[in-house]
């Protein structure tokens, strides 16, 4: 008799999830010598232990603590780049500006980026059919709780000037409901962080507006100022040129505004 299985609204666990996490861990430790001490099998066991046999709507940050402990990593606290709705450009930037780090440049972020996972209550099975959707099913699902946990810790670790890349093509350039707006902004530590500097990335070729005057940016400035952190904002009018100039700063065309 087939067992009844909960049908969730979201996509199921990414195929080859265990193999992908393990392989990403091995690769990360190979290319980051400072993390060579990490035992990737133990990392996978801790990751699995966070959600296997647990109801996928009842996951807590506590479930991820063994994984957090194994993935403890020191990144320079003054070289942190946050992002919202513009992940690809943020990752291209840190590939070029190698002394800066997004969350996905850390071990735990690198393991989980773009993956989906969940289990089932009281069975050791991974659910490849469906997983809970944050809106339609529940917010305390394995993926959402993971990102909330690692994002909070990442923001808490930041110091001095923290940069955030924001997508100027969105109707809400700053969205209070994004991970940046709902988690990271509120976990920056005012006693450590002096300034949050927003980089607003323009999408259109001929878009010369000052998007730092956008109402949602003013809302971000207000939230940040109330937390006793200074706020500054820059328009990045030409993201392609911006990346090229980060790569080749001595290029003669890189003295003008980008």
């Amino acid at each position: 008799v087939p067992r009844w299985r909960q049908q969730w609204s979201g996509p199921g666990t990414t195929k080859r999830f265990p193999e992908t996490v393990l392989a990403r861990c091995v690769k990360y430790t190979e290319i980051h010598p400072e993390m060579r001490h990490v035992d990737c099998q133990s990392v996978w066991d801790a990751f699995k232990g966070a959600f296997i046999s647990k109801h996928p709507c009842n996951i807590t940050e506590e479930d991820y603590q063994p994984l957090m402990k194994l993935g403890t990593q020191t990144v320079p606290c003054n070289k942190i780049l946050l992002w919202s709705r513009i992940k690809d450009l943020a990752h291209q930037f840190t590939q070029v500006q190698r002394d800066m780090f997004t969350l996905e440049d850390t071990l735990l972020g690198y393991l989980a980026d773009d993956l989906t996972w969940c289990g089932e209550f009281n069975t050791s099975k991974i659910n490849y059919q469906s997983c809970p959707d944050w809106r339609k099913d529940c917010s305390n699902n394995p993926v959402s709780v993971f990102w909330k946990t690692v994002s909070r810790r990442f923001a808490e670790a930041a110091c001095d000037v923290v940069h955030v890349m924001l997508n100027g093509s969105r109707s809400k350039i700053f969205d209070k409901n994004s991970t940046f707006g709902s988690v990271e902004v509120h976990n920056l530590q005012p006693e450590k962080v002096q300034t949050l500097e927003a980089w607003v990335i323009h999408g259109g070729r001929e878009d010369s507006r000052d998007l730092c005057q956008d109402p949602t940016i003013k809302e971000l400035e207000s939230i940040i100022s109330k937390r006793n952190i200074q706020f500054s904002c820059k328009n990045i009018y030409r993201p392609d040129k911006f990346l090229q100039c980060v790569k080749n700063p001595e290029d003669s065309s890189c003295t003008s505004e980008i």
């Epitope: 080859r16 992908t20 996490v21 393990l22 392989a23 990403r24 690769k27 291209q92």
Partner: nanobody
């Protein structure tokens, strides 16, 4: 399935140079990397260096300053220029394509580099 084909190995004297080439069936994009590993007799395979989609290279400490990786994205090709070769560089050199999203390593068949007088 990414196919990789290496060439350029051989016998060289200490202090000499060699250039390895690797042609891949897929370009480097997103967070994928293409590069080189080596395996000396009786030792584990170790990373030599790699290049990412933005053209930025990384090297193992043991080869920094002597080896240079470059890429030609139009040809899906990665090169390893090895200068000032030492006997301890003797190994089978493997081309590697790392597919981040899938969590998969793809490997060439390997090319022998021997540094000996």
């Amino acid at each position: 399935q990414v196919q990789l084909q290496e060439s350029g190995g051989g016998l060289v004297q200490p202090g000499g140079s060699l250039r390895l080439s690797c042609v891949g069936s897929e370009r480097i994009f997103s967070r994928n990397t293409m590069g080189w590993y080596r395996q000396a007799p009786g030792k584990q395979r170790e990373l030599v260096g790699y290049v990412g989609s933005m053209g930025i290279t990384n090297y193992a400490d043991s080869v920094k300053g002597r080896f240079t990786i470059s890429s030609d994205n139009a040809k899906n090709t990665v090169y390893l220029q090895m200068n000032n070769l030492k006997p301890e560089d003797t190994a089978v050199y493997y081309c590697n394509y790392w597919h981040y999203a899938a969590g998969r390593d793809y490997w060439g068949q390997g090319t022998q580099v021997t540094v000996s007088s």
